[in-house]
Amino acid sequence: KIDACKRGDVTVKPSHVILLGSTVNITCSLKPRQGCFHYSRRNKLILYKFDRRINFHHGHSLNSQVTGLPLGTTLFVCKLACINSDEIQICGAEIFVGVAPEQPQNLSCIQKGEQGTVACTWERGRDTHLYTEYTLQLSGPKNLTWQKQCKDIYCDYLDFGINLTPESPESNFTAKVTAVNSLGSSSSLPSTFTFLDIVRPLPPWDIRIKFQKASVSRCTLYWRDEGLVLLNRLRYRPSNSRLWNMVNVTKAKGRHDLLDLKPFTEYEFQISSKLHLYKGSWSDWSESLRAQTPEEEPTGMLDVWYMKRHIDYSRQQISLFWKNLSVSEARGKILHYQVTLQELTGGKAMTQNITGHTSWTTVIPRTGNWAVAVSAANSKGSSLPTRINIMNLCEAGLLAPRQVSANSEGMDNILVTWQPPRKDPSAVQEYVVEWRELHPGGDTQVPLNWLRSRPYNVSALISENIKSYICYEIRVYALSGDQGGCSSILGNSKHKAPLSGPHINAITEEKGSILISWNSIPVQEQMGCLLHYRIYWKERDSNSQPQLCEIPYRVSQNSHPINSLQPRVTYVLWMTALTAAGESSHGNEREFCLQGKAN
C-alpha cells in the first residue's frame, strides 16, 4: 500500500510478488460513503499503471486483470473521478515481478594466510529483480556448521570471520550457499576442501640479499614466511628486462643461493609461497626487492683509434680515442682509463690515468716507433689492454681504398661504399671508416667517430652522431700489418641550398687582375656539403646578365683571382655557394674598379 487509503482499498491477487509472465488481478473498491457526493452511480474509478490510464469503471469497485508486467517494480494507482471535480487518489499498490534464484555456481572458498579468515565467492546467476537472501553454510569437524546471511542486493561474497587452523590439516570442510526469495530457493553444489586446499599463504616479507665477499657469484636471498610454508618460487630479472628467471625450491627455510646473476646489474626479486606440493594455491608475489649486484673486473677490450698531426720537422701530435665498454663488458663503474705510451726501440714508457674523457692527446718526436696500450679500470680491476702501433695511416698509396662514395640513406644515415685497394686486396686485415664534422679550420677538437669493418666488406652504414644538414669528412682506411692506406670524401645525410652566400671581405689588384677573398659560410648555414662557389660580376648600372666563375669547393680555400675585368670600369661583385640541392642567395655586394692600363 502506498498511502493511507482512507477512501478505499487496492487488493492484488495472488500476491504482490509474482513470477515473470504471471497474471495478476487488481481490485479497487471504495469504502462506504466515500463515493461521489449525491450520485454514487456516477462514481468513475480509474486504474493507472504509473501515469498511464489502463482501465476505468462506474460504480463502487473495479476489477482489472493485468498481464505482461516487466521485471522490476510496477506502481498501480486507483483514482476516483466525479463530475466537476479533480480526480481523487483512492489507493495504490506496488507489484514486484521477478524470478526464482538460479542455482549459485562456482562456489569457492579461500583463507588468506594462516591467521586469515575463510571467505567464499560464487556466481549468482541472472538477477532475480527481487529481494534475495543468501545463506552461506560451512560444515566441518565436531559436527559444527557455521552460517552467515548476506542481505546485500548483489551478494556474491561472504567472509565468515572464522580462522581455520592446521591441527588436523586433512579434516574435510563443506561449503554450500543457498539463495532464497519469495518465488523460490536454490542451493549450490557443495564444495568440499581441507585446510591445505584453501589456505593461501601470505606473500613472503622482509626480503634481503647478501653478497659474500662482495662477489656476485656468492649471493644469497633471504626472506620470512608463514610457519607452514613448504614450497617457494623465486623470480628475478634485471630491472630493464621484461623476462623473468624462475626458480622453484622446496623446504628453503627462507634462504636460497643464486648463481647466475650478472655483475653491476640492478635486479628485481619476488617470492611466492605454497603450503603443499599439490594442494592449495600459491601466495601473491611478494613486494619487489631491488638490489644492485657487486662489480667484477671488466671483460672485453676497448676499441681504440687515433689521429696523427704534423707539428714541425721534429714533433707530431697524437690524439687517441676510445669507445666506452658496453655495460656487460664494463661490469662496474669505470673509474679511469690507463694509457701507456711506449717507444718500442728505446723502451721508454709513460703511463697516465684518464678520468672523465675517452680521448687523450700528446706530442711525441717524429722519430722512433711508438705504441700505445689502453685499458679500462673499475673498483675490481682492469680490462685487458688494447695495443696499437702508431703508424702513418695513409702512407701506403697502394693500400688506399678506391672509388669511395657517400650517399644519404634515410634520415641521419650515410652509406659509405668503396672498392678494395689495387694492391693485393687479400692483404687487407680490416677497414676503418672514420667521420667527423667538417670544420674549415680543421679543428682537432671536433669529435671523431669510427667503425671497424671486416676485410670482405665494401660498404658501411654510418649513423652514430650524424645530423641532418651537416657535412662530414669521411675517411676509409685499409689496414694491413703495420701499413695503412686511406681515401676521403665529403658526405651528408640530408642537404638543401645554403642559407647564405660567402661574405667578400677584400678585393685587391695584382698585375692587371684582381684577387677576391671571402669569409667561409658559417657551418650552420652551409646546409650540407658545399660543391662549388660562384663569383658573379657585372658593370655597375648595367642591365646585362652578370658573368660568373665557378670554383670547386676546397676546405682551406678562401681566395681566388679573376683576370677578365676591364680597367677603369666599376664592377659590382658578389658570391654564392652551392650544395647538391641548389644555390644559396647572394652574399654581400662589393664594388671595384681596376686601375691598370687598357690593353
Epitope: 552467515k148 565468515f160 570471520g161 580462522n163 587452523t165
Partner: nanobody
Framework: QLQLVESGGGLVQAGGSLRLSCAAS????????VGWFRQAPGKEREFVAA???????TYSEFVKGRFTISRDNAKNTVYLQMSSLKPEDTAVYYC???????????????????WGQGTQVTVSS
Amino acid sequence: QLQLVESGGGLVQAGGSLRLSCAASGLTFSGYTVGWFRQAPGKEREFVAAINWSSAYTYSEFVKGRFTISRDNAKNTVYLQMSSLKPEDTAVYYCAAQRSRTSWYASTAEAYDYWGQGTQVTVSS
C-alpha cells in the same frame, strides 16, 4: 577487563519461549566471538550456540531450528531466543566471550577467555 552479565532466565512451560541476554561492560565486544553454554545438574557443561564478530553463527545439533542467536553491537549485547523449549533444556545458561580471532573450535569451553555468572532456565512439563 570485560564483565558479562546474563539475564532473561526463569521458569517456563514446555513448548514455551524465553529470550536470554548477555550484556558486556568494561570493553566494547563487537570484535569478540560470544558463545552460550549450559550445564544441567550432574552433567558436563555443553555448547549451545555462538556468534562471531562478523555475525556468522553456529548451533549445537540439539537446539538447531529452535534457538536463534543474534547480537546488537550498539547495545553491547548478545541474545539467545529460545522457543519450543523442552524439559531437557533445563540448565544454568552461561555466556562466554573469546578475545582472539574466531577459531573453528568455538564450541569448546577452552576457547573462551571471559565468562558470566549464569542464569537459570527451568522448563516444566
